[in-house]
């Protein structure tokens, strides 16, 4: 039984140019957590594997930084990285748990982060 | 050691599919990239595409989308890659390769003898 | 896409001879950030499959010898071997994995005069 909750940035604002922090945190489980996943809709961004580490792909390796933690950081904002975004946390036992954040990147000055949510 | 074991030869007519398999031992196999290399005498390497076991996250030449559609069985640790509509131009030895994963991605350490495939009437 | 040129396409040597092939990129394959040539070297006899011999440009595989060295830094790469034996008649193939899709040169094949 996955009884797991996946905590999020939620929806998240950014400045075209800046960094932003995608944050996931598995939580309410005893599960071993084996590898994340971060994908920008269908697209691989970084996998965090627990015994090998991270593996960033290339298509993304100028402007993604692994971490803090089983985070990821986005560099050199464009208004193109508007979307949704995805941790997918491969557990043993539980399977797997996917978390969505929805980054919005403005062109003006006014980017403020949006409240935190749970997705169970 | 790391050992990928290819599939054998195939001939096979203008038109219709194929599917090849490599089967990878000596490592955990969710953990790492598999590649395809196709080599035609006279046009040397050319690289088809990768997959992750592990998430079954693929990329791809553009020229080769459409053509190859690479999967891999995670219970069987074997790889496998479909090509369609295949044609005299499809003629070629295809390798698997160990793409590896991190700071050893991209490069191949490890290759398959190799899947002949020769299109023919 | 990243093109990769390699020179000359065939190489006449003798044993015992210092031999130097080149391999130029369309776009350079330094990364900034960490300062790494992302070019493999590969080596292939007839009949067999390729075989890693370099990456990053200059680190050699295990169980390559010391005699072959790669170098270069950013598109202009070479790959000498300081005096060639017979077992190192083959093709040599340089590769680029910077960016998708990752691309091969042409070859240069080492035979003998």
């Known amino acids: 039984m996955m009884t797991g909750t996946i905590e999020t940035t939620g929806n998240i604002s950014a400045e075209k140019g800046g960094s932003i922090i995608l944050q996931c945190h598995l939580s309410s489980t005893t599960a071993q957590v084996t590898q994340v996943n971060w994908e920008q809709q269908d697209q691989l961004l970084a996998i965090c594997n627990a015994d090998l580490g991270w593996h960033i792909s290339p298509s993304f390796k100028d402007r993604v930084a692994p971490g803090p933690g089983l985070g990821l950081t986005l560099q050199s904002l464009t208004v193109n990285d508007t979307g949704e975004y995805f941790c997918i946390y491969h557990t043993y036992p539980d399977g797997t748990y996917t978390g969505r954040i929805f980054l919005e990147v403005l062109e003006s000055s006014v980017a403020e982060h949006g409240a935190r949510f749970q997705i169970p | 050691q790391v050992q990928l074991q290819q599939s054998g030869a195939e001939l096979v007519r203008p038109g219709t599919s194929v599917k090849m398999s490599c089967k990878a031992a000596?490592?955990?196999?969710?953990?790492?990239?598999i590649g395809w290399v196709k080599q035609r005498p006279g046009h040397g390497l050319e690289w088809i595409g990768d997959?992750?076991?592990?998430?079954?996250?693929?990329n791809y030449d553009e020229k080769f989308k459409g053509k190859a559609t690479l999967t891999a069985d995670t219970s069987s640790r074997t790889a496998y890659m479909q090509l369609s509509s295949l044609t005299s131009e499809d003629s070629a030895i295809y390798h698997c390769?160990?793409?590896?994963?991190?700071?050893?991605?991209?490069?191949?350490?490890?290759w398959g003898a190799g899947t002949t495939v020769t299109v023919s009437s | 896409d990243i093109v990769m040129s390699q020179s000359p396409s065939s190489l006449p040597v003798s044993v015992g001879e210092k031999v130097t092939m080149s391999c130029k990129s369309s776009?350079?394959?330094?990364?900034?950030?960490?300062?790494?040539?992302?070019l493999a070297w590969y080596q292939q006899k007839p009949g067999q499959s390729p075989k890693l011999l370099i990456y990053?440009?200059?680190t050699r595989e295990s169980g390559v010898p010391d005699r072959l060295t790669g170098s270069g830094s950013g598109t202009d790469f070479t790959l000498t071997i300081s005096s060639v034996k017979a077992e190192d008649l083959a093709v040599y193939y340089c590769?680029?994995?910077?960016?998708?899709?990752?691309?091969f040169g042409g070859g240069t094949k080492l035979e003998i005069k």
């Open positions: 990053w440009a200059s």
């Open positions: 997959i992750y076991p592990g998430g079954g996250y693929t």
């Open positions: 590769q680029q994995y910077h960016k998708y899709p990752f691309t």
């Open positions: 000596g490592y955990t196999f969710t953990n790492y990239w």
């Open positions: 390769v160990n793409g590896g994963y991190g700071s050893t991605y991209g490069y191949f350490d490890v």
């Open positions: 776009q350079s394959l330094l990364f900034s950030s960490d300062q790494k040539n992302y």
